[in-house]
Interface confidence: low
């Protein structure tokens, strides 16, 4: 599930990881675009083990997953989590 959560709060990610997370461990991905109170794009991966990881948007693996999800969900608009 590819989701965009627009917020007027500050940045959420205090540190970002580029470590690969296998797709089978991923529950969902959230994208906070640049702006809305944060000067950078943030990608947050919700893992199936109940943890959350902020991912480096430049990491090649997350870009591949996002591209695939974009194609998959192009017909349906993203739904906010909260």
């Amino acid at each position: 599930v590819l989701e965009v959560y627009y917020t007027h709060l500050r940045c959420r990610c205090v540190q970002e990881s580029s470590v690969f997370i296998p797709r089978r461990f991923i529950d969902r991905i959230q994208i906070s675009p640049r702006g809305n109170g944060c000067p950078r794009k943030e990608i947050i991966v919700w893992k199936k083990n109940k943890s959350v990881v902020c991912v480096d948007p430049q990491a090649e693996w997350i870009q591949r997953i996002m591209e695939m999800l974009r194609k998959k969900s192009s017909s349906t608009p993203p739904v906010p989590v909260f």
């Epitope: 470590v19 943890s51 959350v52």
Partner: antibody, heavy 123, light 111 residues
Framework: EVQLQESGPGILQPSQTLNLTCSFS??????????VGWIRQPSGKGLEWLAH???????RYNPALKSRLTISKETSKNQVFLKIANVDTADTATYYC???????????????WGQGTTVTVSS | DIVLTQSPASLAVSLGQRATISCRAS??????????MHWYQQKPGQPPKLLIF???DLESGIPARFSGSGSRTDFTLTVNPVETDDVATYFC?????????FGGGTKLEIK
Amino acid sequence: EVQLQESGPGILQPSQTLNLTCSFSGFSLSTFGMGVGWIRQPSGKGLEWLAHIWWDDDRRYNPALKSRLTISKETSKNQVFLKIANVDTADTATYYCTRIAGYYGSRDWFAYWGQGTTVTVSS
Amino acid sequence: DIVLTQSPASLAVSLGQRATISCRASESVDNSGISFMHWYQQKPGQPPKLLIFRASDLESGIPARFSGSGSRTDFTLTVNPVETDDVATYFCQQSNKDPWTFGGGTKLEIK
């Protein structure tokens, strides 16, 4: 404001089933990422995590006690329940209800606690 | 299970001085660059209160004299300067692996 309140029988006998209720306000267990759990503390001793339940009905148990534990929820009533079967004197403790995390869904620490309910198992 | 060993079991510190509490895990509690170690304060007759989450993040409303540090297996809670209100028992907790576990506690007293 998040508030949690535990209730229990106070005293029960060995081999009985302990039924605990956590009534909470200030959040809903239907909200994505919310979890409620139980922790106990024998008098003057340390803390032991027992179980927790997530908004999506995912349930986690302490393996050392799993065979005796059942956690459930009544989302519409803002309540979570814990049953401990076949209690023994070692189950005498203060039982705390907790809400888990809430900081951007990382869901891994006990952010809010009830005042606790004291349970004594005695013959 | 991940065993958390706190040291010392108790310590007495003079007002205004620094108190340092250690928590050592039997295996790493880090995951994807995040340390899943948290600290709580418990006063007599009260439930524990969250102080620090993810090793070093200060919970909202907690005074800045509390700080946390560490990674993988070795973590520290520092109280500096110590005040009379800090007399309590402090617990560490890990949530990297089920079952989530707590340290045995460290009792802080005023010298």
